[in-house]
């Protein structure tokens, strides 16, 4: 005969655990139902009655199956240097990320504490490493034979066009100028762009373990070292 299915609340067999989406209530000493995401426990179970769940109120949420007496408050509205990439719903918290063209310069357990504008490489310098959601752009001087004539956080150094006859030689910040005869090889018009980073940072990130050399204080998520600002510029 098949085993009889127990309905919550029920007393578990000695040494056994409650089933999926159930929890053991210490007071009732019974296995009781958890509440689904978007709900919370309005009334805890007893020996004779199961958990009574209720929907989360506005601006509160529960993301997991739970038996919490109150839903969690959604975070504050996003700061003006951030954008809301996920709205507060009954089942998930609001997520704020740095706005496009910015990156997270300092993370804390609550999410991004400081957003900063991505470095712009000035003429004569191109992007060596694009910015990400947590790291700044790295600029590098344009090597001989390449140039960048823009102030940009995305443009890389481009090769000079190759002329049959050079009118003005190119340099790090200017393309070569050919005489009226067309160049033998030319780059496609327009600057070469690197893709902007896509931000996915949650407002409530888990802290990473500290490196063994870290100070003993409760610490932020460390970022990698930043290059010097040579070749970068403000707006």
């Amino acid at each position: 005969l098949p085993a009889q299915v127990a309905f919550t609340p029920y007393a578990p067999e000695p040494g056994s655990t409650c089933r999926l989406r159930e929890y053991y209530d210490q007071t009732a000493q019974m296995c009781c139902s958890k509440c689904s995401p978007g709900q919370h426990a309005k009334v805890f179970c007893t020996k004779t009655s199961d958990t009574v769940c209720d929907s989360c109120e506005d601006s509160t949420y529960t993301q997991l199956w739970n038996w919490v007496p109150e839903c969690l408050s959604c975070g504050s509205r996003c700061s003006s240097d951030q954008v809301e990439t996920q709205a507060c719903t009954r089942e998930q918290n609001r997520i704020c990320t740095c706005r496009p063209g910015w990156y997270c310069a300092l993370s804390k357990q609550e999410g991004c504490r400081l957003c900063a504008p991505l470095r712009k490489c000035r003429p004569g310098f191109g992007v060596a490493r694009p910015g990400t959601e947590t790291s700044d752009v790295v600029c590098k001087p344009c090597a001989p034979g390449t140039f960048s004539n823009t102030t940009s956080s995305t443009d890389i150094c481009r090769p000079h066009q190759i002329c049959n006859v050079v009118a003005i030689p190119g340099n790090a910040s200017m393309d070569a100028v050919c005489t009226s005869t067309s160049p033998t090889r030319s780059m496609a018009p327009g600057a070469v762009h690197l893709p902007q980073p896509v931000s996915t940072r949650s407002q409530h990130t888990q802290p990473t373990p500290e490196p063994s050399t870290a100070p003993s204080t409760s610490f932020l998520l460390p970022m990698g070292p930043s290059p010097p600002a040579e070749g970068s510029t403000g707006d």
């Epitope: 504050s76 609550e110 991004c112 957003c115 504008p117 204080t217 460390p222 970022m223 990698g224 600002a229």
Partner: antibody
Amino acid sequence: QVQLVQSGAEVKKPGASVKVSCKASGYTFLSYGLSWVRQAPGQGLEWMGWINAYNGNTNYAQNLQDRVTMTTDTSTSTAYMELRSLRSDDMAVYYCARWDILTAYYSSDAFDIWGQGTMVTVSS
Amino acid sequence: DIVMTQTPLSSPVTLGQPASISCRSSQSLVHSDGNTYLNWLQQRPGQPPRLLIYKVSNRFSGVPDRFSGSGAGTDFTLKISRVEAEDVGVYYCTQTTQFPITFGQGTRLEIK
């Protein structure tokens, strides 16, 4: 006690560079950020940028980004601020200020300890 | 950039009397982490600035309890319950909610 001691006054010609030091003592250097703030004679305070002493990351005020570099020497608990291509309007008292922003929970998130200031005169 | 505007720019006060300085920001200083990073600094003549109040209303260590901060969002106030001679100087509000960090233009407190 916790303190920041800055290098002495400097007199520079326009176009030159200046490097101001700020030696920290009495606290764990790596656990804090350091900001640099300047004050022109008779004027208010202007934020120049900051350095995260833990990892060396920097962010600068956009109007100074081309000319300023902030560094640290963790072995001596000293921060440095170099300003290049000096102009007459760079004449100011330059302050370093500890920024209690790195610790996770009980930080003030404010500039809580200030150096005594370094006067930089730019004159031809 | 967030612009910080202080009023008044100068405040003559009688010793033992209260004083109040207002600071208004051009946009809300409430961070997405729920904190409001508005601080008050005091700069006595010939000295570096000194932190008085952080996160709107928290007195920094060693600051006398006659100093208090209040406010929310974009409007903040520093109050001195009974002005003493050593309180003479310039008071600045500053926001560290977001880059760039900005300061108010300063309020000069002087004795009548």
